[in-house]
């Protein structure tokens, strides 16, 4: 299976609410043999791999943001942990993987990744990540909402805030 | 905080099994891998083997397949390791290890020392 | 299965020395290796993760360098109470595999 990132760049200004979202995809066996643990966390671009280390998001690591359960369900994160930190991590049943965070500040710019583990009896483990850069801004040359720069060639959109 | 808690240590006869247990407290126990690792005295570290509580998804090191059994009890947050035919090459002390996917042995449980004696 | 080899089983150093341990991995891991302390008596704990990272609450003395099969794991400055033995693990590919140890004693 894969992950794909739908925007590279998210630039937000002080105050908004941004999405950020992953979508994996590829053969997916719902049998009961196979889970899929999906998380987020802060990074930063290292020499030799992208999403290398593992930051906390406001204070929440990567194990606090988790979601896991087999094939394409739907999860949430505990809404209680989220609300107190303004962030909600949730899952799709089409594969969408996203970040919610809220009330954002410039503390918040950063490299972000998604991760998926595929967690199958017998079997090493299968990873892999996305990774994306939100920057927040203020002042006078911040736009009035997100906008969000596609991963590929397209034309950037505008993006709803959350 | 996360803690792994180990039960205490087991003087075993030959031919015997012990089983070994680790509680789990301060996270989500069913979402990161249980690690069992074996120290024999004065040696290194050997995997042995884990067990992922959420699914009961399990892989082994290929040389404790039919000595090492892993099992976990989501409702009580506890991993166990069951050695069967014990002998003295199992006299170790055995450690139990979180392992959230995807990542490496981010903590441990204080080991509980087996010694195999007739 | 992936062999990691820690070349020296044993280290002399001295109190405030720059010290390097290092380990081989028999085939490409990227960079997925972590390093951990044993303290006689305890339990081994996380000191560096994805080859350069430390983990939380780490001192910053301890750092770690590498990538593909040739991992390095330097204290800057030695304290008494780093004395005591280091692993390397792979974290790579399952059966996940560590290296026999390196024990850094005084000079």
């Known amino acids: 299976f894969k992950v794909a990132t739908l925007y590279s760049l998210y630039v937000c200004p002080e105050g908004q609410n941004v999405t950020l979202t992953c979508r994996f995809f590829g053969p997916v066996d719902k049998g009961h043999d196979v889970t899929f643990y999906k998380t987020w966390y802060r990074s930063s671009r290292g020499e030799v791999q992208t999403c290398s280390e593992r930051r906390p998001i406001r204070n929440l690591t990567f194990q606090d943001l988790h979601l896991h359960h087999g094939g394409h369900q739907a999860a949430n994160t505990s809404h209680d942990l989220a609300q107190r930190h303004g962030l909600e991590s949730a899952s799709d049943h089409h594969g969408n993987f996203s970040i919610t965070m809220r009330n954002l500040t410039l503390l918040d710019s950063g490299l972000y990744c998604c991760l998926v583990v595929e967690i199958r009896h017998h079997h090493s483990e299968h990873r892999v990540h996305g990774a994306m850069e939100l920057q927040v801004q203020t002042g006078k040359d911040a736009p009035s909402s997100c906008v969000a720069y596609p991963s590929s060639s397209q034309e950037s959109e505008n993006i709803t805030a959350a | 905080q996360v803690q792994l808690q180990q039960s205490g240590a087991e003087l075993m006869k030959p031919g015997a099994s012990v089983k070994i247990s680790c509680k789990a407290t301060?996270?989500?126990?069913?979402?990161?891998?249980i690690e069992w690792v074996k120290q024999r005295p004065g040696h290194g570290l050997e995997w042995i083997g884990e067990?992922?509580?959420?699914?009961?998804?399990?892989n082994f090191n290929e040389k404790f397949k039919g000595k090492a059994t892993f099992t976990a009890d989501t409702s009580s947050n506890t991993a166990y390791l069951q050695l069967s035919s014990l002998t003295s090459d199992d006299s170790a002390v055995y450690y139990c290890?979180?392992?959230?996917?995807?990542?490496?042995?981010?903590?441990w449980g204080a080991g509980t020392t087996v010694t195999v004696s007739s | 299965d992936i062999v990691m080899t820690q070349s020296h089983k044993f280290m002399s150093t001295s109190v405030g020395d720059r010290v390097s341990i290092t380990c081989k991995a028999s085939?490409?891991?990227?960079?997925?290796v972590a390093w951990y302390q044993q303290k006689p008596g305890q339990s081994p704990k996380l000191l560096i993760y994805?080859?350069?990272y430390r983990y939380t609450g780490v001192p910053d003395r301890f750092t770690g360098s590498g990538s593909g099969t040739d991992f390095t794991f330097t204290i800057s400055s030695v304290q008494a109470e780093d004395l005591t033995v280091y692993y390397c693990?792979?974290?790579?590919?399952?059966?996940?595999?560590f290296g026999g140890g390196t024990k850094l004693e005084i000079k």
């Open positions: 290890a979180r392992r959230p996917p995807g990542w490496f042995f981010d903590v």
């Open positions: 301060g996270y989500t126990f069913s979402s990161s891998w």
């Open positions: 067990i992922f509580p959420g699914s009961g998804s399990l």
């Open positions: 085939q490409d891991v990227t960079t997925d």
């Open positions: 994805s080859a350069s």
């Open positions: 693990q792979q974290h790579y590919s399952s059966p996940w595999t």
